[in-house]
């Protein structure tokens, strides 16, 4: 008799999961000499231990502690971009300007980035058919968590000028509900944190607005100055030539506005 | 000249309801989160509740959750707070008050007392 | 009971220096902006110092310091006319709230 499984509304968990965390974990430290030390096993045993056996909407912080020390890693604190809805972009940005971090390119984030994973309670399973999602199941579910955790902790880390780029195409350019406008903007440490500079970046070609003047971005400013952190923004009007002007910063186009 | 006045304060029986409203004038209220702050007769003053530029978001003190609700109208350049099943507690005078980043509350009202009694 | 504490009184007489405090934790006054108000009797509050600055028309007599979880508000000169209650604020992460301090009523002798 099949046994009676547990229907979320998100998908399931990834396939090959633990094929796919692993070889993740062995390129990355492969790539990254400062991580050679990093046993990827013991990694994916410690990724595995926080989700497995346990009720997927009962997962905590507290679950991921194991997997965090595993993947302690120091990135330079004032070379930190965080982004809202526009993760390809500041991917592409720091694959170019190779000097500064997403969380993505930190080991945890690299190693979970677009993949989805569930257990169930009391059974060694992976669940491959369904994973609670955010909204329509519960909050505390084993992907939400992770990404709450480990962006805690990049943002904590964080200092002196951090930047974030935010999608100026979204009515919400700036959106409280995100991760970086729910859990890094309030984790940003102000003892070490001067300035906070978002970057918005259009999407049409034409549109010609100041996208620094969106009310949402205002409201960006009045939470992190009642946090005692410094606000700027700049309009990257054209995000093509943004990129080519990082990859060639001598080219005579890029003196103009971008 | 830069003002805030509030109205809609009045007496009131305990489990009754008001709505205040705030009139801003002399600067762009839709740049700015807004705030209400009341004071007891001889008390300290207390912060009530916050909403934000778009309102999409508001805040609200533990004594006044679930029975105050604060919210705003750009376009009447007007903020304001919807008062349920008021307490005795709740009797007060009520000022709005702008939030300018990095300054504080830099705007206040001239306020409009709240009395709540049988 | 106040999140920030300050002394309910304190005076002075004319020309002299008098400072209240207000003590907090690393959630408000430790992390954020710290306002101080000035309230003259019968009237509403007044924006008297944000983040140890003053805004412009304040006497340069008053100025405000931080150091850790406390702030503090000097008046130097004193005169009667700063006779008030004076009511430090901040921003608080965990609650998600403005606090006030309970208040200083400010009596110049």
């Known amino acids: 008799v099949p046994r009676w499984r547990q229907q979320w509304s998100g998908p399931g968990t990834t396939k090959r999961f633990p094929e796919t965390v692993l070889a993740r974990c062995v390129k990355y430290t492969e790539i990254h000499p400062e991580m050679r030390h990093v046993d990827c096993q013991s990694v994916w045993d410690a990724f595995k231990g926080a989700f497995i056996s346990k009720h997927p909407c009962n997962i905590t912080e507290e679950d991921y502690q194991p997997l965090m020390k595993l993947g302690t890693q120091t990135v330079p604190c004032n070379k930190i971009l965080l982004w809202s809805r526009i993760k390809d972009l500041a991917h592409q940005f720091t694959q170019v300007q190779r000097d500064m971090f997403t969380l993505e390119d930190t080991l945890l984030g690299y190693l979970a980035d677009d993949l989805t994973w569930c257990g169930e309670f009391n059974t060694s399973k992976i669940n491959y058919q369904s994973c609670p999602d955010w909204r329509k199941d519960c909050s505390n579910n084993p992907v939400s968590v992770f990404w709450k955790t480990v962006s805690r902790r990049f943002a904590e880390a964080a200092c002196d000028v951090v930047h974030v780029m935010l999608n100026g195409s979204r009515s919400k350019i700036f959106d409280k509900n995100s991760t970086f406008g729910s859990v890094e903007v309030h984790n940003l440490q102000p003892e070490k944190v001067q300035t906070l500079e978002a970057w918005v970046i259009h999407g049409g070609r034409e549109d010609s607005r100041d996208l620094c003047q969106d009310p949402t971005i205002k409201e960006l400013e009045s939470i992190i100055s009642k946090r005692n952190i410094q606000f700027s923004c700049k309009n990257i009007y054209r995000p093509d030539k943004f990129l080519q002007c990082v990859k060639n910063p001598e080219d005579s186009s890029c003196t103009s506005e971008i | 000249e830069v003002q805030l006045l509030e109205s809609g304060g009045g007496l009131v029986q305990p489990g009754g309801s008001l709505r205040l409203s705030c009139a801003a004038s002399g600067f762009t209220f839709s740049d700015y989160e807004m705030n209400w702050v009341r004071q007891a007769p001889g008390k300290g003053l207390e912060w009530v509740s916050s909403i934000s530029i778009t309102g999409s978001w508001t805040y609200y003190a533990d004594s006044v959750k679930g029975r105050f609700t604060i919210s705003r109208d750009n376009s009447k350049n007007t903020l304001y707070l919807q008062m349920n099943n008021l307490r005795a507690e709740d009797t007060a005078v009520y000022y709005c008050a702008n939030y300018k980043s990095y300054y504080g509350m830099d705007v206040w009202g001239h306020g409009t007392t709240v009395t709540v009694s049988s | 009971q106040s999140v920030l504490t300050q002394p309910p009184s304190a005076s002075g007489t004319p020309g002299q220096r008098v400072t209240i405090s207000c003590s907090g934790s690393?959630?408000?006054?430790?992390?954020?902006?710290v306002n101080w108000y000035q309230q003259l009797p019968g009237t509403a509050p007044k924006l008297l110092i944000y983040n140890v600055q003053r805004p412009s028309g304040v006497p340069d007599r008053f100025s405000g310091s931080k150091s850790g979880t406390s702030a503090s508000l000097a008046i130097s000169g004193l005169q009667s006319e700063d006779e008030a209650d004076y009511y430090c604020a901040a921003w608080d992460d965990s609650l998600n709230a403005w606090v006030f301090g309970g208040g200083t009523k400010l009596t110049v002798l």
């Open positions: 690393r959630s408000n006054i430790g992390t954020n902006l």
